[in-house]
């Protein structure tokens, strides 16, 4: 048995007569043989669920669900209740109604076995019938909404009449009907004004019925019509078995470059027309098991269940359903030497499904794990300026497909063929598994004998120690020019274009700093600043070379304070700045300030 509503509303007036009928509560059956029996909770409750007093005023007919006053609620009774309401004015009280034998203990009141009946209290006597508006004669102030379980026997779930009005104003004629489309499963009995279902409902066909209740009031010669929404929601039960959309029960996957733990290798989708179990219960009651295969597969893969509500069209309306994505996920990083093919089976069980048929599906994943061989191009041939400063980035080495790698740890090393010309260094970038080539020793760059640098690049997979090699030829270009005296170590210190471009700084590939002119649009990512190379600094990312020394690009790498209009970078540096940003790495400070508009004019004049 279950209530067709979780809450009911009615009005209470001072000195309303004992015996006044208040309202009906309705229960619907889960099985044809069930007979409802109603019981009232012992207490009246007030604001914030405060227990006010034992209920001495309202009774229920156990078999019909009729609530009525068995004792008039006078002023003194009301005062007594108000005192206990934690100092709040008492405007509403409620009672709990239970369905016996569903719940014999008065605790939490939860649908379906308990409903709350709210009474709005009016500190006046019942108004004169002639003063009542048609709306007040027809419907309670709070609009009702109904819950009906699918596949259950039909039954009565509502009674339209406002009983106190009918009882106290017998001369006013009130008639009701339901406006509904053809073939809907509801009827309103003209004599009893009871609304019932004609047949069992199927949520998978229709989940919501937005009906309209029409009330016609006859008072003397006057006739008025009032319409209110009459919404019915059909509640789901697990009566649909899981299925494969388009019959797809197999997914094939190749594991090659993405070998990192938590990588989703393949996904299979299961459709269930039901939306139960509810999300809290779903993963416990809708189980997926990776069936025992070889130990390696059990250790290497896991299945993740990702349920999602969706909506599907049924008979011209949309009803909710569930799609379950089952993702085959790597449980660990896979070595590049791993090479095997297997079929994995996953058993999905909708454990609440009662049939007919089985609530079980078997998912198949065909997985090929391919080995990755490390390849480098046979040669790289790059150039570097003889004026380049330490940490200048001059190139990138990358094993074949390195940008696609994840979970593969490749380290790059340089082996120089000329001991005295070991100018370059390499650092491995974790983001794209590449190696960034940079100037490590500027003195060697200036030696006449070091006009061409010869290296062997060695890429090593850390897990398997497999290697790939490439020849790296670097020509040293141009002539060396000593820089101006008094230039700072970091390009970022310079606040003006002129002083920026006449100096070099750490990380500068040309031996000169570059000025980046901003767009002047408030706090912007494109702020004006002085940089060793605008290709890499600032770009909102402190790269693996820039981490070597804070003087290279504090705009991207500073962890200190930024003064002025800015947006901080994640996790460091300046994401956006106002005007011109310059930095003092030693002091761990950057300043973003409005552009000095007079400055370029002055520079031109002073030339």
């Amino acid at each position: 048995l279950y209530f067709s509503r979780d809450a009911y509303w009615e009005k209470l007036y001072v000195d309303q007569a004992a015996g006044t009928p208040l309202l009906y509560v309705h229960a619907l059956r889960d099985a044809p043989e069930e007979v409802p029996s109603f019981r009232l909770g012992q207490h009246l409750y007030g604001t914030y669920r405060t227990r006010l007093h034992e209920n001495n005023w309202i009774c229920i007919q156990e078999d019909t669900g009729l609530l009525y006053l068995n004792r008039s609620l006078d002023h003194s009774s009301w005062e007594k209740l108000s005192v206990r309401n934690r100092g709040f004015p008492l405007l509403t009280v409620y009672l709990k109604v239970f369905l016996s034998p569903t719940s014999l203990r008065e605790g939490e009141c939860q649908w379906p076995g308990c409903a709350r009946v709210y009474f709005s209290f009016f500190n006046t006597s019942f108004p004169a019938c002639s003063s009542l508006k048609p709306r007040e004669l027809c419907f309670p102030e709070t609009r009702p909404s109904f819950r009906i379980r699918e596949n259950r026997p039909p039954g009565t779930f509502h009674q339209f009449r406002l009983l106190p009005v009918q009882f106290l104003c017998p001369n006013i004629s009130v008639a009701y009907r339901l406006l509904e489309g053809e073939g809907l499963p509801f009827r309103c009995a003209p004599d009893s004004l009871e609304v019932s279902t004609r047949w069992a409902l199927d949520r998978e066909q229709r989940e919501k019925y937005e009906l309209v209740a029409v009330c016609t009031v006859h008072a003397g010669a006057r006739e008025e019509v009032v319409m209110v929404p009459f919404p019915v929601t059909v509640y789901d039960e697990d009566d649909s078995a899981p299925t494969f959309p388009a019959g797809v029960d197999t997914a094939s996957a190749v594991v090659e470059f993405k070998r990192k733990e938590d990588t989703v290798v393949a996904t299979l989708r299961v459709f269930d027309a039901d939306v139960v179990p509810a999300s809290g219960e779903l993963v416990r009651r809708y189980t997926s098991t990776l069936l025992p295969g070889d130990t390696w597969a059990q250790q290497t893969f896991r299945v993740e269940h990702w349920p999602n509500e969706t909506s599907v069209q049924a008979n011209g309306s949309f009803v909710r359903a569930t799609v379950h994505d089952y993702r085959l996920v790597l449980n660990r990083n896979l070595s590049i030497s791993e090479n095997r093919t297997m079929q994995l089976a996953v058993l999905v069980n909708d454990s609440d499904f009662q049939g007919p048929g089985a609530g079980v599906l078997l998912l198949h994943f065909n997985v090929s794990v391919l080995p990755v061989s490390l390849h480098l191009p046979s040669t790289y041939s790059l150039s570097v300026s003889r004026r380049a400063r330490r940490f200048a980035q001059i190139g990138k080495v990358c094993v074949e497909n390195c940008q696609a790698f994840s979970g593969i740890n490749v380290q790059y090393k340089l082996h120089s063929s000329g001991a005295n010309c070991s100018t370059l260094g390499v650092v491995t970038s974790a983001e794209d598994t590449s190696g960034i080539l940079f100037v490590n020793d500027t003195k060697a760059l200036r030696r006449p004998k070091c006009a061409e640098l010869h290296y062997m690049v060695v890429a090593t997979d850390q897990q398997t120690s497999r290697q790939a090699q490439a020849q790296l030829l670097v020509t040293v270009e141009g002539s060396y020019v000593a820089e101006e005296a008094g230039c700072p170590l970091s390009c970022a210190v310079s606040k003006r274009r002129l002083e920026c471009e006449e100096c070099g700084g750490l990380g500068s590939p040309t031996g000169r700093c570059e000025w980046r002119q901003g767009d002047g649009k408030g706090i912007t990512r494109n702020f004006s600043t002085c940089s060793p190379s605008t290709k890499t600094c600032p770009d909102g990312h402190c790269d693996v070379v820039e981490t070597q020394d804070i003087n290279i690009c504090p705009q991207d790498c500073l962890r200190g304070s930024i003064v002025g209009g800015h947006e901080p970078g994640e996790p460091r540096g300046i994401k956006a700045g106002y005007g011109t940003c310059n930095c003092f790495p030693e002091e761990e400070k950057c300043f973003c300030e409005p552009e000095d508009i007079q400055d370029p004019l002055c520079d031109e004049l002073c030339r």
Epitope: P377, T379, Y380, S381, L382, S383, V384, S385, A388, A392, Q393, I394, G395, K396, V397, C398, G418, C421, P448, K449, C450, A451, E452, L473, T475, P509, T510, S533, K535, T536
Partner: antibody
Framework: EVQLQQSGPELVKPGASMKISCKAS????????MNWVKQSHGKNLEWIGL????????NYNQKFRGKATLTVDESSSTAYMDLLSLTSEDSAVYYC??????????WGQGTSVTVSS | DIVLTQSPASLAVSLGQRATISCRAS??????????MHWYQQKPGQPPKLLIY???NLESGIPARFSGSGSTTDFTLTINPVEADDVATYYC????????FGGGTKLEIK
């Protein structure tokens, strides 16, 4: 297969400027510096300059400073040469050529530029 | 700039014979333990093609009939034996100081 595909022939008026493109394929574009060479009258070869596509750093033959500007677009693996304030002296075939050691191992097919009023 | 002078300006050789082309630099082009001299072949309507790099290293795909030698200021390209397909203009190039090319030697078959 390494290929350097240059833009088509150009006829330009004196004083105008123009841009020649060189699209690289078949190798890692940022792994090799790019050279540009001028050949006049089907004979004299002159080195204009080079650019490292990774960082955009250039080195010019002093003679071509102010005449040629080298740039790259890493996303399309394309090198560009802007020729400025053209005169009849600039009529020639221009080549892009991949850097190999100090030599040039792969060459584009050449772009013929004729400067004439 | 270092000036490269090629000789002869043109050369006619019988098929199967040896062809020798000389390239003289106005100053030394040695550096880092090797000489920075390279040789190219150019056929009409085509771009130059690298034959020899760093004085004596044969570029991949080039027949062993081509060889290079020399040091400091005097360098030689030898083709032995000459084949009909070798008809072309040959250029030397140095890079000890910037990069300059020789004036070219035109090879013909006698």
């Amino acid at each position: 297969e390494v290929q350097l595909q240059q833009s088509g022939p150009e006829l330009v008026k004196p004083g105008a400027s123009m841009k020649i493109s060189c699209k690289a394929s078949g190798y890692s574009f940022t792994g090799f510096t790019m050279n540009w060479v001028k050949q006049s009258h089907g004979k004299n070869l002159e080195w204009i300059g080079l650019i490292n596509p990774y960082n955009g750093v250039t080195n010019y033959n002093q003679k071509f400073r102010g005449k040629a500007t080298l740039t790259v677009d890493e996303s399309s693996s394309t090198a560009y040469m802007d020729l400025l304030s053209l005169t009849s002296e600039d009529s020639a075939v221009y080549y892009c050529a991949r850097h190999y050691s100090f030599a040039m191992d792969y060459w584009g097919q050449g772009t013929s530029v004729t400067v004439s009023s | 700039d270092i000036v490269l002078t090629q000789s002869p300006a043109s050369l006619a050789v019988s098929l199967g014979q040896r062809a020798t082309i000389s390239c003289r630099a106005s100053e030394s082009v040695d550096g880092y333990g090797s000489s920075f001299m390279h040789w190219y072949q150019q056929k009409p309507g085509q771009p130059p093609k690298l034959l020899i790099y760093r004085t004596s290293n044969l570029e991949s795909g080039i027949p062993a009939r081509f060889s290079g030698s020399g040091s400091t200021t005097d360098f030689t390209l030898t083709i032995n034996p000459v084949e009909a397909d070798d008809v072309a203009t040959y250029y030397c190039q140095q890079n000890s100081e910037d990069r300059t090319f020789g004036g070219g030697t035109k090879l013909e078959i006698k």
